[in-house]
């Protein structure tokens, strides 16, 4: 007795597929092709065993609610359309729904709508409302995302802080001496002139020797970066070795030392 799919039905049930979040209302529309004098309109859910469970009904201008008051049938002003709504849908409301009508004597007729599917999905995290409510438990994925974003922000802040500390400890001076050409020749300020940065890296623990550094080679045509290495007038005490963890403050070179410019 399995009837073939019929191309036309005097009852329509739409939408064919409906997805709502849990807690939202889910509304289908059941429409009659015409308005008979006397009829009963029922709303059903298909059980896993393919049995129909009647949810609510409309009969002769009166609504018959089912056992669960969340299922509501409302006749619209045009008389042909009926809203069939689930108030505050739950996850287990997901399933197959349809509407059916019986037109009462003298000509008793049964009509069934096509089936429609409802999917109720889990509620996603919403922005906090003004009313104080306990924050919902974050899902694993979301938690990971929050931790990741926080880590990146902390990393960026640490980098900024490190940059600031380095800038404070090693201030860049725009003045410096160039050993290019003769001593009397002023520094070139043109676009071709390579900028000279004077960087004081604190005290370096060299083996002390009574020897002046060798003069640097003449300027190469390519751009060369220079650093000023300051040699103290006396051997550095063991407690004043420069290291990554104990950087010394910038100390201007004493006149007798003279600037030592070394290409980096």
């Amino acid at each position: 007795l399995d009837s073939p799919d019929r191309p036309w039905s005097p009852l329509t049930f739409s939408p064919a597929q409906l997805t709502v979040q849990e807690g939202e209302n889910a509304t289908f529309t059941c429409s009659l092709a015409d308005i008979p004098d006397s009829f009963v309109l029922n709303w059903y859910r298909l059980s896993p065993r393919n049995q129909t469970d009647k949810l609510a009904a409309f009969q002769e201008d009166r609504i018959e609610p089912g056992r669960d008051r969340r299922f509501r049938v409302t006749r619209l002003p045009n008389g042909r359309d009926f809203h069939m709504s689930i108030v505050a849908a739950r996850l287990n409301d997901s399933g197959i729904y349809l509407c059916g009508a019986i037109y009462l004597p003298p000509n008793t007729q049964i009509n069934e709508s096509p089936r429609a599917e409802l999917s109720v999905t889990e509620r996603t995290l919403e922005p906090p409302t003004q009313s104080p409510s306990p924050p919902p438990r974050l899902s694993g994925q979301l938690q990971g995302l929050v931790i990741g974003v926080t880590s990146v922000l902390v990393g960026v802040l640490l980098l900024l802080l490190l940059t600031w500390v380095l800038a404070a400890v090693f201030p860049r001076a725009t003045r410096g001496a160039c050993v290019c050409g003769s001593e009397d020749e002023p520094l070139k300020e043109g676009p071709d002139a390579a900028p000279v940065f004077t960087l004081d890296y604190g005290e370096l623990d060299f083996q002390w020797r009574e020897k002046t550094p060798e003069p640097p080679a003449p300027c190469a045509p390519e751009q060369t970066e220079y650093a000023t290495i300051v040699f103290p007038g006396r051997p550095a005490s063991p407690g004043r070795r420069a290291s990554a963890s104990s950087l010394q403050g910038a100390q201007p070179p004493s006149p007798e030392d003279g600037p030592g410019l070394w290409p980096l």
Epitope: L1, D2, S3, P4, R6, W8, S9, P10, N42, Y44, L46, N50, Q51, T52, K54, L98, G100, I102, N107, T108, Q109, I110, N111, E112, S113, R115
Partner: nanobody
Framework: QVTLKESGGGLVQAGGSLRLSCAAS????????MGWFRQAPGKEREFVAG????????YYADSVEGRFTISRDSAKNTVYLQMRSLKPEDTAVYYC?????????????WGQGTQVTVKP
């Protein structure tokens, strides 16, 4: 052509139960819905219960809602009417009916009927 044959009627005490069956044969593939009507002596035939064959939607007269249950077995081309808490006023000849299309009516085809008598 569709042929319908009822069975399961009989005599029962008030408060008792009966199960009626209606077997369809012939061009059963055209059946869209089936149902039960009854006719008491001196009264008009009245609708009792109906079922849509495709979706299994069910319908009942107010007088039997909650006491009677209609169901179908597609494999056997059979429709059933389980009657519980029977009352003397349920006494009647029960007829099986079939609707052959969306545009048809529940009464396109009729069975011969089966007698149900409920004693007070």
């Amino acid at each position: 052509q569709v042929t319908l044959k009822e069975s399961g009627g009989g005599l029962v005490q008030a408060g008792g139960s009966l199960r009626l069956s209606c077997a369809a044969s012939g061009r059963t593939e055209i059946i869209y819905a089936m149902g039960w009507f009854r006719q008491a002596p001196g009264k008009e035939r009245e609708f009792v219960a109906g079922i849509g064959w495709s979706g299994g939607t069910t319908y009942y007269a107010d007088s039997v809602e909650g006491r009677f249950t209609i169901s179908r077995d597609s494999a056997k081309n059979t429709v059933y009417l389980q009657m519980r808490s029977l009352k003397p006023e349920d006494t009647a000849v029960y007829y099986c009916a079939a609707q052959d299309s969306v545009a048809g009516t529940l009464g396109d085809y009729w069975g011969q009927g089966t007698q149900v008598t409920v004693k007070p």
